[in-house]
Interface confidence: low
Amino acid sequence: AGVFELQIHSFGPGPGPGAPRSPCSARGPCRLFFRVCLKPGLSEEAAESPCALGAALSARGPVYTEQPEAPAPDLPLPNGLLQVPFRDAWPGTFSLIIETWREELGDQIGGPAWSLLARVTRRRRLAAGGPWARDIQRAGAWELRFSYRARCELLAVGTACTRLCRPRSAPSRCGPGLRPCAPLEDECEAPPVCRAGCSLEHGFCEQPGECRCLEGWTGPLCTVPASTSSCLGLRGPSSATTGCLVPGPGPCDGNPCANGGSCSETPGSFECTCPRGFYGLRCEVSGVTCADGPCFNGGLCVGGADPDSAYICHCPPGFQGSNCEKRVDRCSLQPCRNGGLCLDLGHALRCRCRAGFAGPRCEHNLDDCAGRACANGGTCVEGGGAHRCSCALGFGGRDCRERADPCAARPCAHGGRCYAHFSGLVCACAPGYMGSRCEFPVHPDGVSALPAAPPGLRPGDPQRYL
């Protein structure tokens, strides 16, 4: 269980000529609100497929009225986070759709009218519990800046919020509503308690007692805008109540990605996701065909079926992107069981197992037999997270504590009679047969089917099975 959180920092006209002056139509004032939709996986899903991971609506933003001849400002936004709770595991890979809706407040018959102003789709990988990820997206003539994160709630921990933890003070048994109980961690990996007063909206902490600020904010409690000048012009709302919501200049400012590429900020740099037909650091290389070898990492290039895509790259396992330029984070699928650490070595996945577990995916529990004695000389056999006893002759049951009748299975062949013996069983063979189970016929000339009868035993003597 957990919650996905989205913070819209700014929505306004994008850079460049031809940007709209106002989101409102000529009919009068309007206000904005946002709809966020989460879909699982990274596939190009149809726009109308459902928000299977969840969805949420923002509140309405303040009413905006265009001022004639005034410079186009960023638009007043709704306050607060958009939160999308999720009940099951956080999938790690997901599609994020953010829709900006305009509510026109003019004199329409029947009340307000709504129209979709911009729609941004972003396919991302995101581990729960990580820091805020920041993004800037262009949608037509509009530009949207936002941050998002996924965090676990209740007693869930881990990058997928699938492990349940138990606070140190809690009893060892599962409380009501905790399903499934296993595997319970020894203690909760609760998020650290930040410095008292640290802004919930603009600050975060990775160690107890600290207060680290999101870009654009400063001060010991992250309550002071880093630069009031960043609240001016085209880059975000400024008000006495909300302060400046906009981060300072970032690598994606001005959108360095050409040809419709979308920019994502990475630590100290940026990354362009290019549309088909373009590649390069800034999506600046165009007019590409298969002859140019645009598919990286061994991707197979085939000519595109339509003029807009001169080629298509079929990527080998472990790579993705329109040019197979991105390595798939195969560890995000959490293949290592029982808390094992996943290592993506490129050519293979490796799981580093916790003590007591083994196997390629840490699936074998080595402690199955620990502290479980098998009685009466039985030996413990491991497997599948449970122990099994292989019992000595004459004993059976889960722990070899039950006496078993060795003759119950009628082990003596050809009419031989079975006698229980302290070390097993003895077969008294019918005339004409010999062997420990009376399995060998004695030939008419007195020679058995065996190479020789054991010394001291005549054909027909009772054979003791040792």
Epitope: R35, E48, C51, A52, A55, L57, G111, P112, W114
Partner: nanobody
Framework: EVQLAESGGGLVQAGGSLRLSCTAS????????MGWFRQAPGKEREGISC????????YTADSVKGRFTISRDNAKNTLYLQMNSLKPEDTAMYYC???????????????????WGQGTQVTVSS
């Protein structure tokens, strides 16, 4: 998998009441405009009531106004239609539907709706 499942239909005498439910799975109705439609044998499917996700406004067709009430419980992911003072002409198969657009369209067209249930039969005897 996306599913809308209607329930609550049945046989009722004229003047009686029924409450239809429509439970969604695979998506969240909170951000969908939800509507009730009905289709009588030999007739086209008609919209009878709708609740928008923008503003939560509700609309009801004139033919059932004052008798039918639409409501939703987002926490339970369920849409309801309370039907009172039922008439024989209300006999039809009743369907619930969902669409992503924030408002109910004025023409009650079913074409904009993306997800449909299988329907529940309502029969009103005289």
């Amino acid at each position: 998998e996306v599913q809308l499942a209607e329930s609550g239909g049945g046989l009722v005498q004229a003047g009686g009441s029924l409450r239809l439910s429509c439970t969604a799975s695979g998506f969240t109705i909170a951000v969908y405009t939800m509507g009730w439609f009905r289709q009588a044998p030999g007739k086209e499917r008609e919209g009878i009531s709708c609740t928008s996700w923008a503003g939560g406004r509700t609309y009801t067709a004139d033919s059932v106004k004052g008798r039918f009430t639409i409501s939703r419980d987002n926490a339970k992911n369920t849409l309801y239609l309370q039907m009172n003072s039922l008439k024989p002409e209300d006999t039809a198969m009743y369907y619930c539907a969902a669409k992503a657009h924030p408002d109910c369209s004025g023409d009650w067209s079913p074409s904009g709706y993306e997800y449909w249930g299988q329907g529940t039969q309502v029969t009103v005897s005289s």
